[in-house]
Structures are given as structure tokens and as C-alpha cells.
Interface confidence: medium
């Protein structure tokens, strides 16, 4: 529930949120935090923040990693916060990328 | 006894503002998301927005119908929480609740806005 | 947004019926739903919450069943201070209310 007292408060949770997405906010609030780490342009792109309602989030943090993209969910607050989403290797680097923070 | 009371009602001019008080005694206001909810005179219950407590950084959110017209703050030092109303129009004539769940409802300030 | 679909609007019944409220949701929102009691110049009273977890005080002919999208209120045996205005709410996101329904007497 949203605060430990009423029983009628929306499941949201606080979440970081890191990304252009945020505007000038460092945290968000919906019903699933996530962390996210996806290449663009050469570039190791790591965004956090949360889906407001729980459809957005269902199809997104089922997809499996790829090498182009890995997001993991949690449901909790905060809970992302010490989550750095990673990308599967398979043994293999991916030459000339850079990690990038979006602010 | 645990209760509410709103206070600041009364009557205002198309889009002149109005801020609205709620009060908190018996119990500490500063535990609970504070949510306000209105209603028209012979009308339903409609959900205008809340602010969260500390622990979640005071978030607020809004019903569409009032986004960027309506700021509710808190005072959790005074027990007290605040629904700030501007750009009033004459359909949000209806009496205020502010509730923190529960059974935790006030008995509610008419704000009539009229010319 | 979530809608809540309430109905019927109005109810007519008599002291000792069995009545049924339904509400509906645009999308599901698990069992975050609620049901409140209102009477004439009053604040809301809550009777139901969590869909059909029933709130300390109120009577046992009071119950609520449901999830997903569709819920209903039900009232075993009305009594005559039972007429009043039901309101579902969901708290899935944030709130919304249902229109409400009027029991009145028949």
C-alpha cells in the first residue's frame, strides 16, 4: 500500500529516476521501478525510473536481455536503486562503446 | 476522538483562489497520504488529488480536471494539511472532504464560486 | 485514467431484501477496490476495502466479492438504515469513484 496507515491509498511505489524522461526530478512514483541499459549510437545508455501503471511494464520486463537492450523491474520503494541492469555477454565485448548516463 | 476538520470555505468570484484548511486532531496527519475529494450538490464523489508523507518526498498528484489550477501541501509540523484552489471556475462550486483513508474523513468546507 | 461503471443508479427496495451493487472497472485493478456508505450531508462511511476485507464496525450483512474488472456490493438482508448512496472506488491508481447508487425505499 501507498503509507503503513489507510487501507484505500494507490500500490505506488518510489522509484529513481535517472534518464531524460525525469525532467528535473531524481525519483518518480508508479506501480514498478526499473533499471535500464540499452546501446545507442555506440553508446552504453542507462536509464531508471518507474511504469505508472502496471500494464505498461508487464511486456517490458518480461523481454529477455538482448544485446541491445536488458531492463530488470522490481516493485517495491527505492527498490531500483542498487539495480544496474546488464546486458548479456556471451563472451563477447562490444567494441568502441562507452557508458553514457542520460541526465 | 480521531477527526478532520476542513475550514477556509466560502464564496469566490470565477477565478479568483481560495486555499482550504484540514486539520488533523487525535491522530498525527504526518503518517498518512492526505487526499481531498469533492462533491456538487447532488453529485458523486470526485477524487482531486493527495500528497504523499515524508518518507516518499511529499508527492503529489492531481485529477485532470484540477492539474496546474490546484497545489495541495501539507504542514505536518501543525497537524495540518492544505488544498490551494486558483483560477477557480463555476463548476467547482462543491463541498471539500480531505480524508487520510480509512475512516478518516473530515465533514467538509463549501466553496462556492459565483459572480 | 480508470473508469468505474456503477449500477444501477438508483435501487428500490424494501427492509429485509437482499440487494446487489455491481461496479465496473475500465481495466483491471486487481482487488484495489473499496466501497463506501453515504448518507444526505455527511462524509462517506467506509464498509469495504481490499474488494472484501470488511472495515471494523460495520455489520456482517455487509459484503463484497470480486477482481479483476467486475465487482459487486451485497447487503443480505437490508435494514431500514441501510438507505443511503453506495459509491465503489477504485485505488488501483490513484482514486476514482463510481457515479454512485441510490437505495431508496420502495
Known amino acids: 500500500m501507498e503509507d503503513e496507515k489507510p487501507k484505500v491509498n494507490p500500490k505506488l511505489y518510489m522509484c529513481v529516476c535517472e534518464g531524460l524522461s525525469c525532467g528535473n526530478e531524481d525519483h518518480c512514483e508508479g506501480q514498478q521501478c526499473f533499471s535500464s541499459l540499452s546501446i545507442n549510437d555506440g553508446f552504453h545508455v542507462y536509464q531508471k525510473g518507474c511504469f505508472q501503471v502496471y500494464e505498461q511494464g508487464k511486456m517490458t520486463c518480461k523481454t529477455p536481455p538482448s544485446p541491445g537492450q536488458a531492463v530488470e523491474c522490481c516493485q517495491g520503494d527505492w527498490c531500483n536503486r542498487n539495480i544496474t541492469a546488464q546486458l548479456p555477454t556471451k563472451g563477447k565485448s562490444f567494441p568502441g562503446t562507452q557508458n553514457f548516463h542520460l541526465e | 476522538e480521531m477527526q478532520l476538520v476542513e475550514s477556509g470555505g466560502g464564496l469566490v468570484q470565477p477565478g479568483g483562489s481560495l486555499k482550504v484548511s484540514c486539520a488533523a486532531s487525535?491522530?498525527?496527519?504526518?503518517?498518512?497520504?492526505i487526499h481531498w475529494v469533492r462533491q456538487a450538490s447532488g453529485k458523486g464523489l470526485e477524487w482531486i488529488g493527495r500528497?504523499?508523507?515524508?518518507?516518499?518526498?511529499?508527492?503529489?498528484a492531481y485529477a485532470a480536471s484540477v492539474k496546474g489550477r490546484f497545489t495541495i501541501s501539507r504542514d505536518d509540523s501543525k497537524n495540518t494539511a492544505f488544498l490551494q484552489m486558483s483560477g477557480l471556475k463555476t463548476e467547482d462550486t462543491a463541498v471539500y472532504y480531505c480524508?487520510?483513508?480509512?475512516?478518516?474523513w473530515g465533514q467538509g468546507t463549501l466553496v462556492t464560486v459565483s459572480s | 485514467d480508470i473508469q468505474m461503471t456503477q449500477s444501477p443508479s438508483t435501487l428500490s427496495a424494501s427492509v429485509g431484501d437482499r440487494i446487489t451493487i455491481t461496479c465496473r472497472a475500465s481495466?483491471?485493478?486487481?482487488?484495489?477496490l473499496a466501497w463506501y456508505q453515504q448518507k444526505p450531508g455527511k462524509a462517506p462511511k467506509l464498509l469495504i476495502y481490499?474488494?472484501?476485507s470488511l472495515e471494523g464496525g460495520v455489520p456482517s450483512r455487509f459484503s463484497g466479492s470480486g477482481s479483476g474488472t467486475d465487482f459487486t456490493l451485497t447487503i443480505s438482508s437490508l435494514q431500514p438504515d441501510d438507505f443511503a448512496t453506495y459509491y465503489c472506488?477504485?485505488?488501483?491508481?490513484?482514486?476514482?469513484f463510481g457515479q454512485g447508487t441510490k437505495v431508496e425505499i420502495k
Open positions: 487525535g491522530f498525527t496527519l504526518s503518517d498518512s497520504s
Open positions: 481495466q483491471s485493478i486487481s482487488t484495489w
Open positions: 500528497i504523499r508523507s515524508k518518507p516518499y518526498s511529499y508527492a503529489t
Open positions: 481490499k474488494a472484501s
Open positions: 472506488q477504485q485505488y488501483n491508481t490513484y482514486w476514482t
Open positions: 480524508t487520510g483513508g480509512d475512516d478518516f
